[in-house]
Amino acid sequence: SEVEYRAEVGQNAYLPCFYTPAAPGNLVPVCWGKGACPVFECGNVVLRTDERDVNYWTSRYWLNGDFRKGDVSLTIENVTLADSGIYCCRIQIPGIMNDEKFNLKLVIKPAKVTPAPTRQRDFTAAFPRMLTTRGHGPAETQTLGSLPDINLTQISTLANELRDSRLANDLRDSGATIRIG
């Protein structure tokens, strides 16, 4: 089941997605698409990165975080009700059957009739944790090549913590944008 994120009409929506680069600047291609993740690639691509840079984007869709450090969270500017739906973040790890796929559900709420002014806040301090990788299986002798490891269990966990925390719920209700360090 998809993790659900909310935004109000007219605001910016934030859909989190992260990975751990093997080394700074050692990037993995990522695509964002509208619709659930298909077998390969992303359907209805709205943004794509390669090993160096963002190489494709469409209006209103951008990466606000430092994608060179693995923060490939998508920001959708000035959302409308039509932006509701499932979005796919796909970390395209080289080799077959390696891609990490996240389906995120965006729910757009109509704007309040008299919206109270809200101040955008940065919640780095509220969530001061690093995404670290955990071992897979038994200890191994291994040579690290130029390839990248992502532990998506932890990313999901962080996303769920954000989603489930009272602070996040309070923020969502107030319409503030949630940002992760």
Epitope: G95, I96, M97, Q142, L144, G145, L147, P148
Partner: antibody, heavy 124, light 105 residues
Framework: EVQLQQSGAELARPGASVKLSCKAS????????MQWVKQRPGQGLEWIGA????????RYTQNFKGKATLTADKSSSTAYMQLSSLASEDSAVYYC?????????????????WGQGTTLTVSS | DVQMIQSPKSMSMSVGERVTLSCKAS??????VSWYQQKPDQSPKLLIY???NRYTGVPDRFTGSGSATDFTLTISSVQAEDLADYHC????????FGSGTKLEM
């Protein structure tokens, strides 16, 4: 301890279908691809396909599309492979194997645990 | 599909000798190559992954090397228990295997 326990030997008639099982234990079944591999007597290994129980993603090699059908039951941590329209060339040992995939930091992509194999004999 | 060609088909060795098994890929597969040992009437077991990484518990007499299209498995001092078939496989694209090399004593 990771274990893959496969169903017992099968004897089938040409044209029939058979369903092989592979029960996984000792790890999170939904977090790893389960692969199926064929080995005919005295021959090499041939990849059939794979299923990712977490989201139901399935891949087949061209040679086994229409021949093999892969499914998984998350509640019992069991993967299944059904082989249809059996012929003598389907006689082989069939293995299930867990796949350790690469991540953004470590290159893996290997079959790390294998079942004991199920021998299928197709004969009239 | 990527073809994996193993040579030789079989080889006869004496205990203590150095053994070199070869595997060639029909196209560049980077270092996405693994080696598996299969003893008679047993399932395959992983020896080497990523072309040169020894898997957990594998004796250090087994060494893998190579990249792109040419790969080698070396057993520095073969033991009686190494009697087995050895399979190379690539996993850059959908997995394919060589036909195996039978090591006989």
């Amino acid at each position: 301890e990771v274990q893959l326990q496969q169903s017992g030997a099968e004897l089938a008639r040409p044209g029939a279908s058979v369903k092989l099982s592979c029960k996984a234990s000792g790890y999170t079944f939904t977090s790893y691809w389960m692969q199926w591999v064929k080995q005919r007597p005295g021959q090499g290994l041939e990849w059939i396909g794979a299923i990712y129980p977490g989201d139901g993603d399935i891949r087949y090699t061209q040679n086994f599309k229409g021949k093999a059908t892969l499914t998984a039951d998350k509640s019992s941590s069991t993967a299944y492979m059904q082989l249809s329209s059996l012929a003598s060339e389907d006689s082989a040992v069939y293995y299930c194997a867990r796949w350790e995939k690469s991540t953004t930091v470590v290159q893996r992509n290997y079959f790390d645990y294998w079942g004991q194999g199920t021998t299928l004999t197709v004969s009239s | 599909d990527v073809q994996m060609i193993q040579s030789p088909k079989s080889m006869s060795m004496s205990v203590g000798e150095r053994v070199t098994l070869s595997c060639k890929a029909s196209e560049n597969v980077g270092t996405f190559v693994s080696w598996y040992q299969q003893k008679p009437d047993q399932s395959p077991k992983l020896l080497i992954y990523g072309a040169s990484n020894r898997y957990t518990g594998v004796p250090d007499r087994f060494t893998g090397s190579g990249s792109a299209t040419d790969f080698t498995l070396t057993i520095s001092s073969v033991q009686a228990e190494d009697l087995a078939d050895y399979h190379c496989g690539q996993s850059y694209s959908y997995p394919t295997f060589g036909s195996g090399t039978k090591l006989e004593m």
